[in-house]
């Protein structure tokens, strides 16, 4: 249902926010070595991708009846 979708999305957004903060806090306490910088890049990219994915979940696909018709009206008239 839409309510369940919204609830799941809200949960995921909250989880991601918490996870991102935890990861960033952990990384900021690590010495700025090359390895730490690389790890921070991985975490940032990973959560950015997850955020992008969950933003698409909000957009509902158009209903099948609301897509392009199999036979376009102008073609049907011409035939």
């Amino acid at each position: 249902s839409e309510a369940e979708d919204a609830s799941l999305l809200s949960f995921m957004q909250g989880y991601m926010k918490h996870a991102t903060k935890t990861a960033k806090d952990a990384l900021s306490s690590v010495q700025e070595s090359q390895v730490a910088q690389q790890a921070r890049g991985w975490v940032t990219d990973g959560f950015s991708s997850l955020k992008d994915y969950w933003s698409t979940v909000k957009d509902k696909f158009s209903e099948f009846w609301d897509l392009d018709p199999e036979v376009r009206p102008t073609s049907a008239v011409a035939a």
Partner: antibody
């Protein structure tokens, strides 16, 4: 030839209502889903609503949900848009469009202003 | 909502030359049925929009073959080869894959 002719637009005060009609001809109206699309003054196009061939399914943009109702009468080859509690931001030219965006009517102007 | 970013905002072309319009989307437009519901329209002054291209690359009925649609993923292009005076107007991209269906902001084509 295929024709879509909108009517029912006009000037209305905020909070008022209007009912738009679209008379279809030149194709088998009852076998096509239909849509309303509007073009606001700054020229941007916005999908407003869609309706299934038999009227059993509908879809709306968030900003008009609960205020606008799309319907159709296949016996009369006519599409409708009942617009209630109109707001200034609903001011636009409203087009009747066949699903797939293949064919558009000439549009009817709706102006919401006090 | 899926954002459609059109560029350029306007262009001026000499008759016979080519013109290209880009439309970038904020997410992919492949529907669950496997098709991509992406369109191009032309709106001439004082007229309704008319469909040029549907499902990325299919020309609508009566549209000259100088209009070509292409693209995939989030990048789509309309190319007009051998531009004619009657091609002047505002070009819009749009999608019908998700709700709400959205349109680009338009590209005004002027013929020099």
């Amino acid at each position: 030839q295929l024709q879509l002719v909108e009517s029912g637009g006009g000037l209305v005060q905020p909070g008022g209502s209007l009912r738009l009609s679209c008379a279809a001809s030149g194709f088998t109206f009852g076998t096509y889903s239909m849509r309303w699309v509007r073009q606001v003054p700054r020229k941007a196009l916005e999908w407003v609503s869609s309706i299934h061939t038999d009227g059993g399914g509908t879809a709306y943009r968030d900003s008009v949900k609960g205020r606008f109702t799309i319907s159709r009468d296949n016996a009369k080859n006519t599409l409708y848009l009942q617009m209630n509690n109109l707001k200034p931001e609903d001011t636009a030219i409203y087009y009747c469009v066949i699903a797939g965006y293949s064919d558009w009517g000439q549009g009817t102007q709706v102006t919401v202003s006090s | 909502a899926t954002m459609l970013t059109q560029s350029p905002g306007s262009l001026s072309v000499v008759p016979g030359e080519s013109a290209s319009i880009s439309c970038k989307t904020s997410q992919g437009l492949v529907h669950s049925d496997g098709k991509t519901y992406f369109y191009w329209f032309l709106q001439k002054p004082g007229q309704s929009p008319q469909q040029l291209i549907y499902q990325v690359s299919n020309r609508a009925s009566g549209v000259p073959d100088r209009f070509t649609g292409s693209g995939s993923g989030t990048d789509f292009t309309l190319k007009i080869s051998g531009v004619k005076a009657e091609d002047a107007g505002v070009y819009y991209c749009a999608h019908g894959t998700y709700y709400p269906h959205t349109f680009g902001s338009g590209t005004r084509l002027e013929i020099k």
